[in-house]
């Protein structure tokens, strides 16, 4: 009758931070000699526990190994980390000089279940414009085992990634995932979100989500129009410059008279549209008695550090008596009106 070393579990899974018991029982108290636990095989195997006087932090024996009739050489590993993953062997030695290995258990593979980090979604450094294709990348790290599912969504619709990679490709204590998706921006995307969803065995069917608000990555340039209201009195003309459906809020509006700055607006009261874009209206009151000649009024809109958008509007001087009451609007948004 030969001593047998029985490791009943082929594998165990344990969450990082928890403790696990690795079971090992012998069928004999003989021959006399120590029992040791190793991780791995061959020359590189690492001693994990020895049923002697040595101290092993985080590893304890489950039963009283000093008891003469004890056949249970199970160990408990506490506060498990991903580095503890591997195959553990319970090994019986025969006492001698040196001790000789006579029997090993079949091994128990320890899988350390480590949760993925919350996914982080990054987008382009510069804002994109409607109809532009932009890439978003989602990254999560530190998970184990390797099997993981990553999905992309935009406004509830699943997107297909350009590529998804899990590294390293070989066996490791923990893994990282990176995925890239391409999104075509549209002008209605200010309120949209791109979501990266990661599902893993450690997450109890509650996937982790990383969110990118497209408002951080899109620029919608305004439509600019200048109009002239009917005169409120003989001496006044009202001009309106309207910037519509722009995002983000960053807007500067300048009124010029014949190319010279007349007024600088720093908009404060923007109106918000349901799609998340903004509108701004600037009123410019022109004193007609001061102008006999034609005057070109320019509304210059600078949005989000982009080149200025200009719209001109010509108001005819008092000398044009034959054009009294007339006003023309040109395709380039130039308009003429007499002063009287």
């Amino acid at each position: 009758t030969e001593v047998k070393v029985i490791q009943p579990e082929k594998s165990v899974s344990v969450a990082a931070g928890d403790s696990t018991v690795l079971n090992c029982t012998l069928t004999s108290l003989l021959p006399v000699g120590p029992i040791r636990w190793y991780r791995g095989v061959g020359q590189s195997r690492q001693l994990i526990y020895s049923f002697t006087t040595e101290h092993f932090p985080r590893v304890t024996n489950v039963s009283d190994a000093t008891k003469r009739s004890n056949l249970d050489f199970s160990i408990r590993i506490s506060n498990v980390t991903p580095e503890d993953a591997g195959t553990y062997y319970c090994v019986k030695f025969q006492r001698g000089s040196p001790d000789t290995e006579i029997q090993s258990g079949g091994g128990t593979e320890v899988y350390v279940l480590a949760k993925p980090s919350p996914p982080e979604v990054s987008g382009p450094a510069d804002r994109g414009i409607p109809d532009q294709k932009v890439n978003f990348t989602c990254k999560s790290h530190g998970f184990s085992p390797r099997n993981i599912t990553l999905k992309w969504f935009k406004d509830g619709q699943e997107l297909h990634p350009l590529e998804t990679t899990v590294n390293p490709s070989g066996k490791n204590v923990s893994y990282n995932i990176s995925s890239t998706v391409r999104v075509v921006l549209n002008s209605m995307d200010v309120n949209s979100k791109v979501i990266c969803e990661v599902a893993h065995i450690t997450l109890d069917r509650s996937p982790l989500r990383g969110i990118a608000n497209l408002s951080n990555f899109i620029r919608v340039s305004p439509t600019v129009k200048v109009t002239q209201q009917s005169p409120t009195s003989m001496n006044q003309v009202n001009l309106t410059c309207r910037a519509e459906r722009f995002y983000p809020e960053d807007l500067q509006l300048i009124w010029l008279e014949n190319g010279n700055v007349s007024r600088n607006d720093t908009p404060k009261n923007l109106t918000k549209n349901t799609d998340g874009t903004y509108n701004y209206t600037s009123l410019f009151l022109v004193n007609s008695s001061a102008h006999r000649e034609d005057v070109v009024f320019t509304c210059q809109v600078k949005h989000d550090q982009q080149p200025a958008i200009t719209r001109n509007h010509t108001v005819l001087g008092f000398a044009h008596s034959s054009d009294q009451g007339s006003m023309q609007t040109f395709p380039d948004n130039n308009a003429t009106h007499n002063w009287n």
Epitope: N23, S28, L30, S74
Partner: antibody, heavy 119, light 107 residues
């Protein structure tokens, strides 16, 4: 002073499962480094070790009965039990439960219960 | 399995006699051996553990010796209450096994 008491039906029909319970009093089944064993004795014959459950969890069975035997523990009731399936007349015996002492050796025994397998 | 051979299977001795029972293991079991006494209709009782150690409350007339494969159990002075069957049991190897028993009677 720990005491053991076997309980279960005295008559079991062939092919059925024999179920016995050993109730521990005067001590906790989950404390100390003990084996809790089942042993049987056929009429007029010697002792046969059936199996044991160790306090730390492992269960050991006699290979000659392993395919038919299950030993389990219920710490909440301070009991351990034996199930022997597919019994025949050859399983007729006095069944004992025992506890190993601080030193080796079974130092506490139940009084034994006779189980007859007959139709 | 380890075979435990006890001899004799029965013996008859007078009160006060020295009684010796032997137990032989089919292979070396070091000193992982216990001796039990079983009286008719009763459960076995532990007398000797680890081949030579007297269990608590057991009279000193009982003793045990031996190591490896050969073991001896002795009653130095047989008493009427010692009428019983005596069993050796090894626990070096699973399954634990008992000897066939030695029935001791008074002449």
């Amino acid at each position: 002073q720990v005491q053991l008491q076997e309980s279960g039906p005295g008559l079991v029909k062939p092919s059925q499962t024999l179920s016995l319970t050993c109730t521990v009093s005067g001590g906790s089944i989950s404390s100390g480094g003990y084996y809790w064993s089942w042993i049987r004795q056929h009429p007029g014959k010697g002792l046969e070790w059936i199996g044991a459950i160790y306090y730390s969890g492992p269960i050991y069975y006699n290979p000659s009965l392993k395919s038919r035997v299950t030993i389990s523990v219920d710490t909440s009731k301070n009991q351990f039990s034996l199930k022997l399936s597919s019994v025949t007349a050859a399983d007729t015996a006095v069944y004992y439960c025992s506890k190993e002492g601080y030193h080796s050796g079974m130092d506490v025994w139940g009084q034994g219960t006779t189980v007859t397998v007959s139709s | 399995d380890i075979q435990m051979t006890q001899s004799p299977s029965s013996l008859s001795a007078s009160v006060g006699d020295r009684v010796t029972i032997t137990c032989q293991a089919s292979q070396d079991i070091s000193n992982y051996l216990n001796w039990y006494q079983q009286k008719p209709g009763k459960a076995p009782k532990l007398l000797i553990y680890d081949a030579s150690n007297l269990a608590t409350g057991v009279p000193s007339r009982f003793s045990g010796s031996g190591s490896g494969t050969d073991f001896t159990f002795t009653i130095s002075s047989l008493q009427p209450e010692d009428i019983a069957t005596y069993y050796c049991q090894q626990f070096a190897y699973l399954p634990w096994t008992f000897g066939g028993g030695t029935k001791v009677e008074i002449k």
